[in-house]
Interface confidence: low
């Protein structure tokens, strides 16, 4: 059986205080 | 090797303002937040807020929100506390830290300033 | 507001024994974001532990950090003479908070 494709991949950006509010780096949002 | 040099001690009279500045060096400033944290003689440590160096956004103790301002200069690599309408009890060591992140966590305030004595006294 | 609340106030204890601090939160709080202080008079605090269990750089092997949810653990293996001095926990929820505070004195 094929199971469902998940469309909720991550998409990823280095970012200052998105993830965290006093990092900067790669942030990854579903 | 990285750290924060803070501005020299301050008197002043109730109801005054004090401008305490945090000079870093040695890391990237813009790449972390600085938190201000001080203590009264005697007393235990009382987080006061957190500046964004990246993007100036502020998140302020509730208790002292309505007197304090958080800044940043990012040419100079120096953040600012002010404090206005002093009162005595806000006679205290004031200190700067930097906040830390480590992958996905909080990795504590890593770097912290050498202290800052505000006096408060008529 | 999560509130952190540190046992005993103060723990008197001889060099060379253990000391265990407890720092107790009125909320949950994730493990990785608890931290442990020490400040030595007339010092800045020193970060010992964050993510309640990971040592910060340069701090001996005798600190140790555990627990989880609201209760949390800080434990020197055996005390030496520059120990005895005051520990703060820390947690970072919405906002930052410190407990009042553990003094290790010498007895």
């Known amino acids: 059986r094929r199971r469902r494709r998940d469309t909720h991949f991550p998409i990823c950006i280095f970012c200052c205080g998105c993830c965290h509010r006093s990092k900067c780096g790669m942030c990854c949002k579903t | 090797q990285v750290q924060l040099v803070q501005s020299g001690d301050e008197v002043k009279k109730p109801g005054a303002s004090v401008k305490v500045s945090c000079k870093a060096s040695g890391y990237t400033f813009i790449k972390y937040g600085i938190s201000w944290v001080r203590q009264a003689p005697g007393q235990g440590l009382e987080w006061m807020g957190w500046?964004?160096?990246?993007?100036?956004?502020?998140d302020y103790a509730r208790n002292l929100q309505a007197r304090v301002t958080m800044t940043t200069d990012t040419s100079t690599s120096t953040a600012y506390m002010e404090l206005r309408s002093l009162r005595s009890d806000d006679t205290a060591v004031y200190y700067c830290?930097?906040?830390?992140?480590?992958?996905?966590?909080?990795?504590?305030?890593?770097?912290w300033g050498q202290g800052t004595t505000v006096t408060v006294s008529s | 507001e999560i509130v952190l609340t540190q046992s005993p106030g103060t723990l008197s204890l001889s060099p060379g024994e253990r000391a265990t601090l407890s720092c107790r939160a009125s909320q949950s709080v994730s493990s990785n974001y608890l931290a442990w202080y020490q400040q030595k008079p007339g010092q800045a605090p020193r970060l010992l532990i964050y993510g309640a269990s990971s040592r910060a750089t340069g701090i001996p092997d005798r600190f140790s950090g555990s627990g989880s949810g609201t209760d949390f653990t800080l434990i020197i293996s055996r005390l030496e003479p520059e120990d005895f001095v005051v520990y703060y926990c820390?947690?970072?929820?919405?906002?930052?908070?410190f407990g009042g505070g553990t003094k290790v004195e010498i007895k």
């Open positions: 820390q947690q970072y929820g919405s906002s930052l908070t």
């Open positions: 830290a930097r906040e830390g992140w480590n992958d996905d966590y909080f990795s504590g305030l890593d770097v």
């Open positions: 500046i964004g160096a990246f993007n100036g956004n502020t």
